[in-house]
C-alpha cells in the first residue's frame, strides 16, 4: 500500500500538465496577503538637528492581495527536465483588511537623500547634492502617502538632476506590471527529489551579489519542496526579496485544518554574525557598519539594489544585535509575531501555510557637505516598514487534500 501511495505521490508532484502539483503551482489556489506596518517617525527635527534616537511608531496593517497572477511564459524543457517561468507581480489594496487608506500620510526617511548621499560619497558630488536638496526644499525626513512610499513618487530633489535619471522612488517601485525571474526549476520527471528546486535564476546559477557559497541559489522558492520531507532536513530556499538563499529547520508538528504539517522556521542562527555562525562570513560585505562583522540580524543588500543602502532584517530587529536597534526607540521584537515560518505537508512537500516576515531598512550616514545630514553624529539603520506575507490553504482545498492525500495514508 505504501509503495502505491509513494508512486502516486511521485506522479502527482511532478511539475507537468495534468498533475495536482502543476495546477496549483501555475496559479496558487491559496489567497496570499501582504500586510505592511509603516514606521512613522515621531521626532524628525530632533534627529536631524541633534542626532537623537529615532522614535518610531508602527502603523498598520495595510493589506494587499498579492500572488494572484498565474505564472507566465511557462516552458517545459524535456532535455534537462526543467520548467521555466516568470512570476508576475501584482498588488491589490484591501481596505477591509487595513487600518486606513493608501492616502494615509507617514513621516519617513527621505529615500532619495539617504540613497544619493550613500551612492555618491565623494565630496564634490555631495556639494552638488546639497545644492539640489536645498533647492528642492528636501530634508532628511519627508511626509509621504502609503501609496507613494510603496509604489513610487516623483522625487523633487532627483528631478533637478539635469541628466536622464530615474526620478521615481518607492520601496517596491516598479512593482505592478513587472515580473520576477526568469526561474528555471526542475520538474521532477527524472528525479522526484529535485522537483521545484531552482536550476537557474535570471539565466544564472549564482547571484553575483555575494562571495563564495553565499552567492548560490539553493533549494526551491519555498512554495513547495521535494516530497517525503523529514523533520531532520534543513530546507533550503531562495528569496528574491532578500537577494539570497536561506534555510528553515523543523520546529514542531502542527495540525492545519485536519492535515498534519511540519512547521519549519528560520532560525536565529541564519541571521547570526560570522563570529557565532562562520558560514555567514560572506554575508558581511563591509567592515564599518557591521562593526568588523560583529553586528548581526541585518543584511546589506545594496549590491542587489543598484547601490542603494537597503538593509533587510526581521521585523522590529528580531534576532539583531543591540547596536543595530540602539538608535531606534519604539521597537518591540517578539518571535511569535515577527519570525518567518513554513507549514509543510511532509508527504507532498507542499507549503500549505506560511508567514514570511521581513523589514526594510535604509542606512543614513552623516555628511559634512550635505546640510540636512550635517548634524548627524552616527550612522542609523532606519526601519521604514515591515511586512507579513501570509497564505493558508482554503477549506475546500484542505478537504480535498485530506481525502486524497492524508486520508489515504492514515
Amino acid at each position: 500500500g505504501d509503495l502505491l501511495i509513494q508512486k502516486t505521490i511521485k506522479k502527482q508532484v511532478v511539475l507537468e500538465e495534468g498533475t495536482i502539483a502543476f495546477k496549483n503551482w501555475v496559479k496558487t489556489g491559496t489567497e496570499v496577503y501582504r500586510q505592511f506596518w509603516i514606521f512613522d517617525v515621531q521626532n524628525p527635527q530632533e534627529v536631524m538637528m541633534n542626532s537623537s534616537n529615532i522614535q518610531v511608531k508602527q502603523r498598520g496593517p495595510y493589506t494587499y492581495r498579492v500572488r494572484f497572477l498565474a505564472k507566465e511564459n511557462v516552458t517545459q524543457d524535456a532535455e534537462d527536465n526543467t520548467v521555466s517561468f516568470l512570476q508576475p507581480n501584482g498588488a491589490i489594496f484591501e481596505p477591509s483588511l487595513s487600518v486606513g487608506t493608501e492616502a494615509d500620510n507617514f513621516t519617513v526617511l527621505n529615500l532619495a537623500v539617504a540613497a544619493a548621499s550613500h551612492i555618491y560619497q565623494n565630496q564634490f558630488v555631495q556639494m552638488i547634492l546639497n545644492s539640489l536638496i536645498n533647492k528642492s526644499k528636501s530634508s532628511m525626513f519627508q511626509v509621504r502617502t502609503l501609496r507613494e512610499l510603496l509604489w513610487g513618487y516623483r522625487d523633487p530633489f532627483l528631478s533637478l538632476v539635469p541628466y536622464p535619471v530615474t526620478t521615481t522612488v518607492g520601496l517596491f517601485y516598479p512593482y505592478n506590471n513587472t515580473a520576477d525571474g526568469v526561474y528555471k526549476v526542475f520538474n521532477g520527471k527524472d528525479n522526484i527529489s529535485k522537483v521545484a528546486i531552482i536550476d537557474t535564476y535570471k539565466g544564472k546559477r549564482n547571484l553575483s551579489y555575494w562571495e563564495s557559497h553565499c552567492d548560490m541559489i539553493n533549494g526551491t522558492d519555498a512554495a513547495s519542496f521535494p516530497p517525503f520531507v523529514e523533520k531532520s532536513q534543513v530546507l533550503q530556499f531562495f528569496s528574491s526579496d532578500i537577494c539570497r538563499s536561506i534555510y528553515a529547520v523543523f520546529e514542531s508538528d502542527v495540525n492545519l485544518k485536519g492535515i498534519p504539517v511540519y512547521r519549519f522556521v528560520l532560525p536565529s542562527k541564519a541571521f547570526a554574525s560570522p563570529v557565532e555562525n562562520p558560514d555567514n562570513y560572506c554575508f558581511c560585505t563591509e567592515k564599518i557598519i557591521s562593526k568588523n562583522c560583529t553586528s548581526y540580524g541585518v543584511l546589506d543588500i545594496s549590491k542587489c539594489k543598484e547601490g542603494r543602502p537597503v538593509y533587510i532584517s526581521l521585523p522590529h530587529f528580531l534576532y539583531a544585535s543591540p547596536d543595530v536597534s540602539e538608535p531606534i526607540d519604539g521597537l518591540n521584537p517578539n518571535e511569535e509575531e515577527h519570525r518567518t515560518y513554513l507549514d509543510i505537508e511532509p508527504i507532498t512537500g507542499f507549503t500549505l501555510q506560511f508567514a514570511k516576515r521581513l523589514q526594510v531598512n535604509l542606512l543614513v550616514k552623516p555628511s559634512e557637505k550635505i546640510q540636512v545630514l550635517k548634524n548627524l553624529k552616527r550612522n542609523y539603520i532606519v526601519p521604514i516598514l515591515w511586512l507579513n506575507e501570509t497564505g493558508t490553504i482554503g477549506d475546500e482545498k484542505a478537504n480535498m487534500f485530506r481525502s486524497q492525500v492524508t486520508g489515504k495514508i492514515n
Partner: antibody, heavy 117, light 107 residues
Framework: EVQLVESGGGLVQPGGSLRLSCAAS????????IHWVRQAPGKGLEWVAW????????YYADSVKGRFTISADTSKNTAYLQMNSLRAEDTAVYYC??????????WGQGTLVTVSS | DIQMTQSPSSLSASVGDRVTITCRAS??????VAWYQQKPGKAPKLLIS???SLYSGVPSRFSGSGSGTDFTLTISSLQPEDFATYYC?????????FGQGTKVEIK
C-alpha cells in the same frame, strides 16, 4: 546646441579689476552650475571658481579667494567672474565651462586677461 | 588638495603607435577622473569621464582605465589629429585639480 561664449578680457594694470562674462545657450546654467578655469601662457589648466547648481554656493581656488567673485544672472543665462586686485600671475586665458558631476563637457573659446603695467 | 601627477610630461610617437599616458592621484579618488585633449589656441575637449567612460563622439581608439590612485589614458593607434596635449583631472574633491599635461609630439 550647447554653447558658451566668454567676453570681457583685456589688458589691466596690477591692482585693477575686470569682469568676465560667460553667455550660455542650449542649456540652463542654473541647472548645471558653471566653472571658470584658467591657463597661463604655456602652462597647464587651473580650476579657479565654481557656482553650484541653483546658485547654491560658490567655491574658489585658494589663489583667488577674497579677490574673485563668481555670480550668475539666470534671466540672462550668463555667468560672471568679477576679478579684483589683479596680479601679474593672474595673466591667463580664462575659460568658462559647464559641469555637473565635476568633469567639463562644454568649454567656451576662452578670453585672454593680461595683467601688466 | 589632491595632486594629480601626470607622466610623461612629453612623448614622441608615430602614427599607428599605441600611446599610454599615466596619472597618479595623491589620494584615493575612486573612479572620479576625466581626461581632456587640448590643441594649441583651442579650448580643451573632454575625452573620458569616470576614469573609463568614453564621452560621446570621441573615437573608440581612446580608452581610460584605473581606479583609486592610478589611471591611464591609452590611444590604441595614434592618428595625425591626435597630436596634442592631454590632461587628467580629478572630479572627486574640491578644489578640482588637473595634471600638468602630457604633450604628444610627432616623432
Amino acid at each position: 546646441e550647447v554653447q558658451l561664449v566668454e567676453s570681457g578680457g583685456g589688458l589691466v594694470q596690477p591692482g585693477g579689476s575686470l569682469r568676465l562674462s560667460c553667455a550660455a545657450s542650449g542649456f540652463t546654467i542654473s541647472s548645471f552650475g558653471i566653472h571658470w578655469v584658467r591657463q597661463a601662457p604655456g602652462k597647464g589648466l587651473e580650476w579657479v571658481a565654481w557656482i553650484a547648481p541653483y546658485g547654491g554656493e560658490e567655491y574658489y581656488a585658494d589663489s583667488v579667494k577674497g579677490r574673485f567673485t563668481i555670480s550668475a544672472d539666470t534671466s540672462k543665462n550668463t555667468a560672471y567672474l568679477q576679478m579684483n586686485s589683479l596680479r601679474a600671475e593672474d595673466t591667463a586665458v580664462y575659460y568658462c565651462a559647464r559641469s555637473f558631476f565635476g568633469y567639463f563637457d562644454y568649454w567656451g573659446q576662452g578670453t585672454l586677461v593680461t595683467v601688466s603695467s | 588638495d589632491i595632486q594629480m601627477t601626470q607622466s610623461p610630461s612629453s612623448l614622441s610617437a608615430s602614427v599607428g603607435d599605441r600611446v599610454t599616458i599615466t596619472c597618479r592621484a595623491s589620494q584615493d579618488v575612486s573612479n572620479w577622473v576625466a581626461w581632456y585633449q587640448q590643441k594649441p589656441g583651442k579650448a580643451p575637449k573632454l575625452l573620458i569621464s569616470y576614469a573609463t567612460s568614453l564621452y560621446s563622439g570621441v573615437p573608440s581608439r581612446f580608452s581610460g582605465s584605473g581606479s583609486g590612485t592610478d589611471f591611464t589614458l591609452t590611444i590604441s593607434s595614434l592618428q595625425p589629429e591626435d597630436f596634442a596635449t592631454y590632461y587628467c583631472q580629478q572630479h572627486s574633491n574640491a578644489p578640482l585639480t588637473f595634471g600638468q599635461g602630457t604633450k604628444v609630439e610627432i616623432k
